[in-house]
């Protein structure tokens, strides 16, 4: 069964029970290349930071290549998704409880800014793929994802016919496409200038305070 | 590099049938569907149907129903199309081609015409 | 029998614009392919989905749709551009694919 974030009563700054996080965010000097806009306060390590950038990484044996070569401009995105899942300490208010045997929690229904969720998209539907989920249905016996027999790879347009049929299909609904822009302050951004701070701590204080007006709101 | 090369030109008789080939290399064979598609002289492109190489699914042509079959080899990476009852009207050029996307066919073998002439 | 439907013959003056059209039912619920075949050779595609090109294809080539009409554009034509040009499109019922009678493009 799964709890609702409310469930928590530590909805910011904290890390995910899950498979690579940390327990305890905190500064991480060295964290590589397009993970490193978390360097002030992250939930993620240097190494797995390291090792995410990898082709079919260590940490989830996850192979981006699945249907031939994936193109660049479009697996920068999934490095970024990557960064913000694994390193991100504002996620707290969209965290729920799973029954997995790989993690306890994951995030359900993030508001993704929609530039975000429409850039990947567009730099992506020329890829290709075979799944329109890929949280499940793969074939692992190898160790490693491949397409499940009879799965063809086809453009990721033809999987995901629109950006949040590719954000919110893609990952179970971790994210849900939000109808804010950019520098709201009312949705996530996965990509970021840590120069001017992490927008995303507004982000979070925003949402966990809605949460707190709307759990108090049912108990009277 | 992703080639399609498809087998030599073939003279037919009416009735007969004819079994095009098609080999495919430098992709995984079984992760992309395979159409047929002919061109009789100077006429447009004619679709015939598809082959899920990874299942041996298949999908043809009201047209060409019953008079075609489409087939597989995996080990071979070698996708088929046989056309029976041949007529000289089946005269054509005889494509196979790499589906992406329903339709949108990126690579095309060079094309094995078939002559049909009693 | 589903069909799309293209004008036989289009010519454009080397270096303008030109657009090579299909109509047709199937249109309206799904993307047009775009193939140049010149003689003798098997078809290229030069436009797939939204408005993509494949890698290869000047980016003078561009698609567009509106409707039951999908629109192939060449901006700037140059004559090694002339060529017939067939359009095609899925049929979502059966997933059968449908092609257009093609355009032969001449440019003068």
């Known amino acids: 069964t799964m709890c609702s974030a409310q469930d928590r009563t530590d909805l910011l700054n904290v890390c995910m029970d899950a498979k690579h996080h940390k327990t305890k965010p905190g500064p991480e000097d060295k964290l590589h290349d397009q993970c490193s806009p978390w360097k002030k306060n992250a939930c993620c390590t240097a190494s797995t930071s390291q090792e995410l950038h990898k082709d079919t990484s260590r940490l989830y044996n996850f192979n981006w290549d699945h249907c031939g070569k994936m193109e660049p401009a479009c697996k920068r995105h999934f490095i970024q998704d990557t960064c913000l899942y694994e390193c991100s300490p504002n996620l707290g208010p969209w965290i729920q409880q799973v029954n997995q045997s790989w993690r306890k929690e994951r995030f359900l229904d993030v508001p993704l800014c929609k530039e975000d969720c429409q850039r990947w998209w567009e730099d992506c539907h020329t890829s290709h793929t075979c799944k329109s989920n890929w949280h499940r249905g793969w074939d692992w016996t190898s160790g490693v994802n491949k397409c499940p027999a009879g799965a063809l790879c086809r453009t990721f347009e033809s999987y995901f016919p629109t950006p949040a049929a590719l954000c919110e299909g893609l990952w179970s609904h971790s994210y849900k496409v939000s109808n804010y822009s950019r520098g709201s302050g009312r949705c996530i951004q996965m990509w970021f200038d840590s120069a001017q701070g992490n927008p995303n701590e507004e982000v979070a204080r925003f949402y966990a305070a809605a949460m707190h007006v709307n759990a108090g709101e049912m108990l009277h | 590099e992703v080639q399609l090369v498809q087998s030599g030109a073939e003279v037919k008789k009416p009735g007969a049938s004819v079994k095009v080939s098609c080999k495919a290399s430098?992709?995984?064979?079984?992760?992309?569907?395979m159409h047929w598609v002919r061109q009789a002289p100077g006429q447009r492109l004619e679709w015939m149907g598809w082959?899920?190489?990874?299942?041996?699914?298949?999908k043809y042509s009201q047209k060409f129903q019953g008079r075609v079959t489409i087939t597989r080899d995996t080990s071979a990476s070698t996708a088929y199309m046989e056309l029976s009852s041949l007529r000289s009207e089946d005269t054509a050029v005889y494509y196979c081609a790499r589906d992406i996307s329903y339709g949108s066919f990126d690579y095309w073998g060079q094309g094995t015409l078939v002559t049909v002439s009693s | 029998r589903p069909e799309l439907t293209q004008d036989p013959a289009v010519s454009v003056a080397l270096g303008q614009t030109v657009r090579i059209t299909c109509q047709g039912d199937?249109?309206?619920?799904?993307?047009a392919n775009w193939y140049q075949q010149k003689p003798g050779q098997a078809p290229v595609l030069v436009i797939y989905g939204q408005n993509n090109r494949p890698s290869g294809i000047p980016d003078r080539f561009s698609g567009s749709s509106s409707g039951n009409t999908a629109s192939l554009t060449i901006t700037g034509a140059q004559a090694a551009d002339e060529a017939d040009y067939y359009c095609d499109s899925r049929v979502s019922t059966g997933n059968h694919v449908v092609f257009g009678g093609g355009t032969k493009l001449t440019v003068l």
């Open positions: 430098g992709y995984t064979f079984t992760s992309y569907a």
């Open positions: 199937s249109l309206r619920s799904n993307y």
């Open positions: 082959i899920n190489a990874g299942n041996g699914n298949t």
